[in-house]
C-alpha cells in the first residue's frame, strides 16, 4: 500500500486559449484531471487502473500552484494504491477550462480541454521528487512526482507491513526496509523476549522485563548464581540447592555441632594450648605459672622456687624478690662468695672446688636439690597431672590423685564412670555426660544402691488370731508373737488341739 504523489508547480497558457485554439471567455479558469494506470508502451484511453484525482480551479491562464491546499484541493495530489507497487506506470494529466462551478465531466462542453499530456516509465519507491516539464504548442506544465509507502508499509514495493508496538506481543520500531528493530532491552524474532540483567545466570535466573534477574527455586543473589542451602543449615554451604556441606570444624546433619571448640570459643586463657577432644570438649595445656581447667588461675611466682642456695622468695606485684642467705648474691642468689672451706653443702652434699677454688659445686644425695642441696626434691613443680589431677609428693616419688572420670599415672586417660562398678548390690550402671546413674534392684536404693530398703513382710497380715507381726530385717521374713492360747508359726493353732491331718 502506498501513494503516488503529483505536485503541480506552474501552468503557462499565455494566450488563454483552449486546445481547439478558441480563446476562453473572459480567461481560461483552469483545473486538472489526473489519471494513473499500469504501464502502457503507448498510453491509450481506458480505465485509470491505479486511480484518478481532480483539482478545483487553480488559476486563470498562467499561474503557479502553491504547495498546500488551494481552494479545497491539495497539492501535492494524492493517488493512493492498495497493492504492491509494480515499479512502472502511465500518467495522463489533462488541463480543463471551467466555464461554471460544476466541474463534473458530464457538465463540461467537450471542447473545454486546454491541454493533455501523457507519460510512462519506471519509478522506484522513494522520498525524492522527479521534476518534469511538458510543453505543447500553446501551453507548458511544470510538475514533479514520486511514490511513497503508506504508514506502516515498507520495502521497495511498499509490500512489507510493519507497525511499531510496545506491548505484550512485541517491543519494536520499523526499519526503512520493514524489518523490526527491537527497543532497548528486548530481543527475539518479534522482540518479545526481555534481555535480563547482565550476568544473570542462564539456567537459574530469568526475567519478565529488561534488566531484571528473577531466581528459580533454590537459587538466590543478584545474578541467581548462589544456591540456597537446606533450611536449618547453620555452618554449611551448598553447591546445588538444598544441600548443607559443613564448614571446617562443624558436624551434624545441619552443621550445628561444634567439632572445633578451641578455634570457635578460645576457652584457654593466659597463652595456654587448646586441644579439641570431641564434640563441645577440649583440654587446656597451661604455660608455667598457671593452672585451672582453662588455665585461668595464676600460680604464685614463688611457687616455682626460683631462689637458689636457700634464698627465701617474696611475692611482689611485678614479680618476686629473693632474700639471699649470707655468702650469696644475685637475682636468684645464684652467685656464691663461699668456697668448700666454708662447708656450704647441706643435707650430706659433697663439695667440689671450681675455678682454682674461687667457686664450688655441691653434689647432692638423692631427694635433695639446689646449689647447696638445701631443697627437698619436689616432683610436683612441673604440674605433671592432667585433667585437674592433684599432685602429691611421696618421699622420693610423686603420684597424681585423679578427678572422677580420669585415670592413668598422670590422669591422662578418660575412663567410663561405670568401669569401677560403682553400683552396689547388683545395680545397673549408666554412663551419663556428667557422671553416672545406678538403676537399683528391688530392696535397694540410694545413689549407688548402697541403702537396703526393707521389704515389709508383715504387709500381707500373715499372723492369725490377733497375733502381733514383726519383720526380721536380716532375712526380710516375718515372726508372729502369739497371744495366750495359740501356737504355730502363724499362731494358727489353739493350744491343746492338735492339728488335724488328712492321713
Amino acid at each position: 500500500s502506498g501513494v503516488f504523489q503529483l505536485q503541480l508547480q506552474e501552468f503557462i497558457n499565455e494566450r488563454g486559449v483552449l486546445a481547439s485554439g478558441r480563446p476562453c471567455e473572459p480567461g481560461c479558469r483552469t483545473f486538472f484531471r489526473v489519471c494513473l494506470k499500469h504501464f502502457q508502451a503507448v498510453v491509450s484511453p481506458g480505465p485509470c487502473t491505479f486511480g484518478t484525482v481532480s483539482t478545483p480551479v487553480l488559476g486563470t491562464n498562467s499561474f503557479a500552484v502553491r504547495d498546500d491546499s488551494s481552494g479545497g484541493g491539495r497539492n501535492p495530489l494524492q493517488l493512493p494504491f492498495n497493492f504492491t507497487w509494480p515499479g512502472t506506470f502511465s500518467l495522463i494529466i489533462e488541463a480543463w477550462h471551467a466555464p461554471g462551478d460544476d466541474l463534473r465531466p458530464e457538465a463540461l462542453p467537450p471542447d473545454a480541454l486546454i491541454s493533455k499530456i501523457a507519460i510512462q516509465g519506471s519509478l522506484a519507491v522513494g522520498q525524492n521528487w522527479l521534476l518534469d516539464e511538458q510543453t505543447s504548442t500553446l501551453t507548458r506544465l511544470r510538475y514533479s512526482y514520486r511514490v511513497i509507502c503508506s504508514d506502516n508499509y515498507y520495502g521497495d514495493n511498499c509490500s512489507r507491513l510493519c507497525k511499531k508496538r510496545n506491548d505484550h506481543f512485541g517491543h519494536y520500531v520499523c526499519q526503512p526496509d520493514g524489518n523490526l528493530s527491537c527497543l532497548p532491552g528486548w530481543t527475539g524474532e518479534y522482540c518479545q523476549q526481555p534481555i535480563c540483567l547482565s550476568g544473570c545466570h542462564e539456567q537459574n535466573g530469568y526475567c519478565s522485563k529488561p534488566a531484571e534477574c528473577l531466581c528459580r527455586p533454590g537459587w538466590q543473589g543478584r545474578l541467581c548464581n548462589e544456591c540456597i542451602p537446606h533450611n536449618g543449615c547453620r555452618h554449611g554451604t551448598c553447591s546445588t540447592p538444598w544441600q548443607c556441606t559443613c564448614d571446617e570444624g562443624w558436624g551434624g546433619l545441619f552443621c550445628d555441632q561444634d567439632l572445633n571448640y578451641c578455634t570457635h570459643h578460645s576457652p584457654c586463657k593466659n597463652g595456654a594450648t587448646c586441644s579439641n577432644s570431641g564434640q563441645r570438649s577440649y583440654t587446656c595445656t597451661c604455660r608455667p605459672g598457671y593452672t585451672g581447667v582453662d588455665c585461668e588461675l595464676e600460680l604464685s611466682e614463688c611457687d616455682s622456687n626460683p631462689c637458689r642456695n636457700g634464698g627465701s622468695c617474696k611475692d611482689q606485684e611485678d614479680g618476686y624478690h629473693c632474700l639471699c642467705p649470707p655468702g650469696y648474691y644475685g637475682l636468684h642468689c645464684e652467685h656464691s662468695t663461699l668456697s668448700c672451706a666454708d662447708s656450704p653443702c647441706f643435707n650430706g652434699g659433697s663439695c667440689r672446688e671450681r675455678n682454682q677454688g674461687a667457686n664450688y659445686a655441691c653434689e647432692c644425695p638423692p631427694n635433695f636439690t639446689g646449689s647447696n642441696c638445701e631443697k627437698k626434691v619436689d616432683r610436683c613443680t612441673s604440674n605433671p597431672c592432667a585433667n585437674g589431677g592433684q599432685c602429691l609428693n611421696r618421699g622420693p616419688s610423686r603420684m597424681c590423685r585423679c578427678r572422677p572420670g580420669f585415670t592413668g599415672t598422670y590422669c591422662e586417660l578418660h575412663v567410663s564412670d561405670c568401669a569401677r562398678n560403682p553400683c552396689a548390690h547388683g545395680g545397673t550402671c549408666h554412663d551419663l555426660e556428667n557422671g553416672l546413674m545406678c538403676t537399683c534392684p528391688a530392696g535397694f536404693s540410694g545413689r549407688r544402691c548402697e541403702v537396703r530398703t526393707s521389704i515389709d513382710a508383715c504387709a500381707s497380715s500373715p499372723c492369725f488370731n490377733r497375733a502381733t507381726c514383726y519383720t526380721d530385717l536380716s532375712t526380710d521374713t516375718f515372726v508372729c508373737n502369739c497371744p495366750y492360747g495359740f501356737v504355730g508359726s502363724r499362731c494358727e493353732f489353739p493350744v491343746g488341739l492338735p492339728p488335724s491331718f488328712p492321713w
Epitope: 537446606h230 543449615c233 554449611g236 538444598w242 544441600q243 548443607c244 556441606t245 559443613c246 562443624w250 558436624g251 551434624g252 546433619l253 545441619f254 552443621c255
Partner: nanobody, 120 residues
Framework: KVQLVESGGGLVQPGGSLRLSCAAS????????IGWFRQAPGKEPEGISC????????YYADSVKGRFTISRDNAKNTVYLQMNSLKPEDTAVYYC?????????????TGQGTQVTVSS
C-alpha cells in the same frame, strides 16, 4: 539416581512406640552416613539422629536421647529409627537424609518424609 524412601510413620498415643525405616538406593550404602531430621509445622528442621557409615558412631539430639535408637542394616540398605516413649512434641514430618560421605556432617540428599502424629 540417589533415592531415600521413608516409611513407618502414623498416629500413635503418647507413651507409644513407632519404628521408622529408610530404604536407600542409587549409591553404595555402606559408604555413607545416614541420619534423621524432623520438621514440625512452622518450625525449623531439627537434626535428631545420625549413624556413621560403619555404624560405629551415632549421635542423638538432647530432645530424643534415651528414647530414640538409630541402627542400620547394610545388607538390606536400610536405616531404622526406633522411637519409644513418644510425646506430643514429637509430632512432625520425619525425613531420612545423607551427607553423601561416611561421617555425619551435612545433608546432600533427602527423602520425601513420613508423618508422625502423637496424640490421644
Amino acid at each position: 539416581k540417589v533415592q531415600l524412601v521413608e516409611s513407618g510413620g502414623g498416629l500413635v498415643q503418647p507413651g507409644g512406640s513407632l519404628r521408622l525405616s529408610c530404604a536407600a538406593s542409587g549409591f553404595t550404602f555402606d559408604d555413607y552416613a545416614i541420619g534423621w531430621f524432623r520438621q514440625a509445622p512452622g518450625k525449623e528442621p531439627e537434626g535428631i539422629s545420625c549413624i556413621s557409615s560403619s555404624g560405629g558412631i551415632t549421635y542423638y539430639a538432647d530432645s530424643v536421647k534415651g528414647r530414640f535408637t538409630i541402627s542400620r542394616d547394610n545388607a538390606k540398605n536400610t536405616v531404622y529409627l526406633q522411637m519409644n516413649s513418644l510425646k506430643p512434641e514429637d509430632t512432625a514430618v520425619y525425613y531420612c537424609a545423607t551427607p553423601g560421605i561416611a561421617a555425619c556432617r551435612g545433608i546432600h540428599y533427602t527423602g520425601q518424609g513420613t508423618q508422625v502424629t502423637v496424640s490421644s
